[in-house]
């Protein structure tokens, strides 16, 4: 159920260091800065709970403005292997080595982690995001080449006191921002090794983790504006549910996807969307400060809760899911995305649902808790919600197993 | 500022492909979908397909489905559109043009012209 | 398909004076109407979005208007850098669609 039990050590509640250590926007991911190497080289570093490797750029290219150079290190330590990371579209490769790793607004520690230096690449690198290397947050059955390289944060945990949790606050902006203002702006918090009562209001509730490779969770029920969905639940989960911070959009399997758009358009039907907003391709436009929030349904998903038959509810309103886009050419208006799309690769609870909330990936007790997020983008008349507990039963039917032989495809 | 530019006139004969580039530059690539559009003189403007260079996922005019493909090259922020079995049918201008709402952005023309 | 119909090939007009072009689509498209200029050898021009909504940069004497089947796009005091073919779009549902276009001609 809540957290309300005494305090771990490591959980003081207040990690004022850490608040504020995240910088960037949902459409083109968040980071922290790191440093890498002996001398320490500062890089900015994409958050990704979606994988399990911490990969960096080392070599020229059009969108870096800086990347890891191996050969001033005198800490660096090459282990003689390549990497390849290939993704439905694009890749990444590099090389694989160790090398001394430390966050400047995290705990003060210093690590030997492993560190795939990227040579290569296509479609991985975007350009204006303004990160150089990605840290794979996920557990070692995802990383890449194999699973016996363990992760950073395994690494972190392993070598430090640090408690073998995080948490994160990732803070849309509720409109767009330039490329100035992201780099001036605050864009969330990374939590590492435990939990700021700060961050978040109300309580927190945990769902299970499934299976330790993504953050892999179960939904047990899908509503729109408070209206059940009807699908078998398995649909929600098929071929799996994650947490990923390294994803835009809340992504659905195809069949929930188009039960939801039908349920929203239904739903907002006062105004007549073209065909491409609900695909992802047109934008929707109001003149300045008239964007009819409440004309668009809150979305809840239902999280298998820790204790038997029990579930909890986190809603999210249009806020999260209608993204603030900036276009020169409709610069008078408010402009917006629909950032629900459809997904091959089951449900990724990407930024527009972890806007909403302070999420706690407490990997030492297996479960993952979600608290209304202090930053959340809302409005005078809905806030974004988690609430429970709700009797819900059978939900073990609801997750999804995936045949063995395809366990090792890689999330995109 | 927000550009597309579109690769030079082409002179092709019936019976060949032609591939026309459409370079974007002034704003985050994949963010925003890319359109191709035909014009023959006198008929107007024709849709013919789209691709979101984020995931190249495409979808087509059915008209154009089998004369038309796009890709696409993250790295160079290049749009491609290949289109296969020349006629004198395919003679025209062909534009690249942005999505936002509508179309704000258009690439300045290539003119294709098939002959034997 | 929807079929956007301008019925209107040519329009004369003299400097000054205000000319309403319209257009008409087959189905509902609710306000997901566009319209582009275009001149001769040039490519298209972005106007008007969502019926009546101004593209950056675009001078106010053009206006838009109508829902549902029925468009026209104004132009008041007429210039003579005005004197184009004139295009409206729906990008209501796939495949988006043209009309035919009308040529703004001088008197």
């Known amino acids: 159920e809540t957290d309300e039990e005494p305090e771990e050590p490591g959980r003081r509640g207040s990690f004022v260091e850490m608040v504020d250590n995240l910088r960037g926007k949902s459409g083109q991911g968040y980071y922290v800065e790191m440093t890498v190497g002996s001398p320490p080289q500062t890089l900015n570093i994409l958050v990704d709970t979606g994988s399990s490797n911490f990969a960096v750029g080392a070599a020229p290219h059009p969108f870096l403005h800086r990347y890891y150079q191996r050969q001033l290190s005198s800490t660096y330590r090459d282990l003689r292997k390549g990497v390849y990371v290939p993704y439905t579209q694009g890749k990444w490769e590099g090389e694989l080595g160790t090398d001394l790793v430390s966050i400047p607004h995290g705990p003060n520690v210093t690590v030997r982690a492993n560190i795939a230096a990227i040579t290569e690449s296509d479609k991985f690198f975007i350009n204006g995001s303004n990160w150089e290397g990605i840290l794979g947050l996920a557990y070692a059955e995802i990383a890449r080449p194999d699973d016996s390289l363990e992760p950073f944060f395994d690494s972190l945990v392993k070598q430090t006191h640090v408690p073998n949790l995080f948490s994160l606050q990732l803070c849309g902006a509720g409109f767009p921002l330039n490329q100035s203002e992201v780099l001036a702006s605050v864009g969330g918090s990374m939590i590492i090794g435990g939990i700021d009562h700060s961050l978040y209001t109300g309580s927190l509730w945990y769902t299970p983790i499934r299976r330790e490779w993504y953050y892999e969770v179960i939904i047990v029920r899908v509503e729109i504006n408070g209206q059940d969905l009807k699908m078998d639940c398995k649909e929600y989960n098929y071929d799996k549910s994650i947490v990923d911070s390294g994803t835009t959009n809340l992504r659905l399997p195809k069949k929930v996807f188009e039960a939801a758009v039908k349920s929203i358009k239904a739903a907002s039907s006062t105004e007549k969307f073209p065909d491409g907003f609900w695909l992802g391709e047109q934008l929707v436009c109001w003149q300045a400060g008239t964007t009819p929030w409440n004309i668009f349904p809150v979305i809840s998903l239902y999280l298998m809760g820790e204790v038997t038959n029990q579930s909890f509810r986190i809603t999210i309103l249009p806020q999260q899911y209608l993204r603030p886009v900036e276009d020169v050419a409709t610069s008078q208006d408010d402009c917006y995305k629909f950032a629900i799309s459809q997904s091959s690769t089951g449900t990724v609870m990407g930024a527009v649902i972890m806007e909403g909330f302070y999420v706690v990936f407490d990997r030492a007790r297996k479960r993952i808790g979600f608290a209304v997020s202090a930053c959340h983008v809302h409005d005078e008349f809905r806030t974004a919600a988690v609430e429970g507990p709700f009797v819900t039963l059978d939900m073990e039917d609801c997750g999804y197993n995936i045949p063995q032989t395809d366990e090792s495809t890689l999330m995109t | 500022e927000v550009q597309l530019q579109q690769s030079g006139a082409e002179l092709v004969r019936p019976g060949t492909s032609v591939k026309l580039s459409c370079k974007a530059s002034?704003?985050?690539?994949?963010s925003y979908w890319i359109h191709w559009v035909k014009q023959r003189p006198g008929q107007g403007l024709e849709w013919i397909g789209m691709i979101d260079p984020s995931d190249s996922y495409t979808k087509y005019n059915q008209k154009f489905k089998d004369k038309a493909t796009l890709t696409v090259d993250t790295s160079s922020s290049t749009t491609y559109m290949h289109l296969s079995s020349l006629t004198s049918e395919d003679s025209a201008v062909y534009y690249c043009a942005r999505s936002g709402v509508a179309f704000p952005y258009w690439g300045q023309r290539t003119l294709v012209t098939v002959s034997a | 398909d929807i079929q956007m119909t301008q019925s209107q090939k040519f329009m004369s007009t003299s400097i000054g004076d205000r000319v309403s072009v319209t257009c008409k689509a087959s189905q509902n498209v609710g306000t997901n109407v566009a319209w582009y200029q275009q001149k001769p050898g040039q490519s298209p021009k972005s106007l008007i979005y969502s019926a009546s909504h101004w593209y950056s940069g675009v001078p106010d004497r053009f206006t838009g208007s109508g829902s549902g089947t029925d468009f026209t796009l104004t132009i008041s005091n007429v210039q003579s850098e005005d004197l184009a073919e004139y295009f409206c779009q729906q990008y209501n549902s796939y495949p988006y669609t043209f009309g035919g276009g009308t040529k703004l001609e001088i008197k």
């Open positions: 002034g704003y985050t690539f994949t």
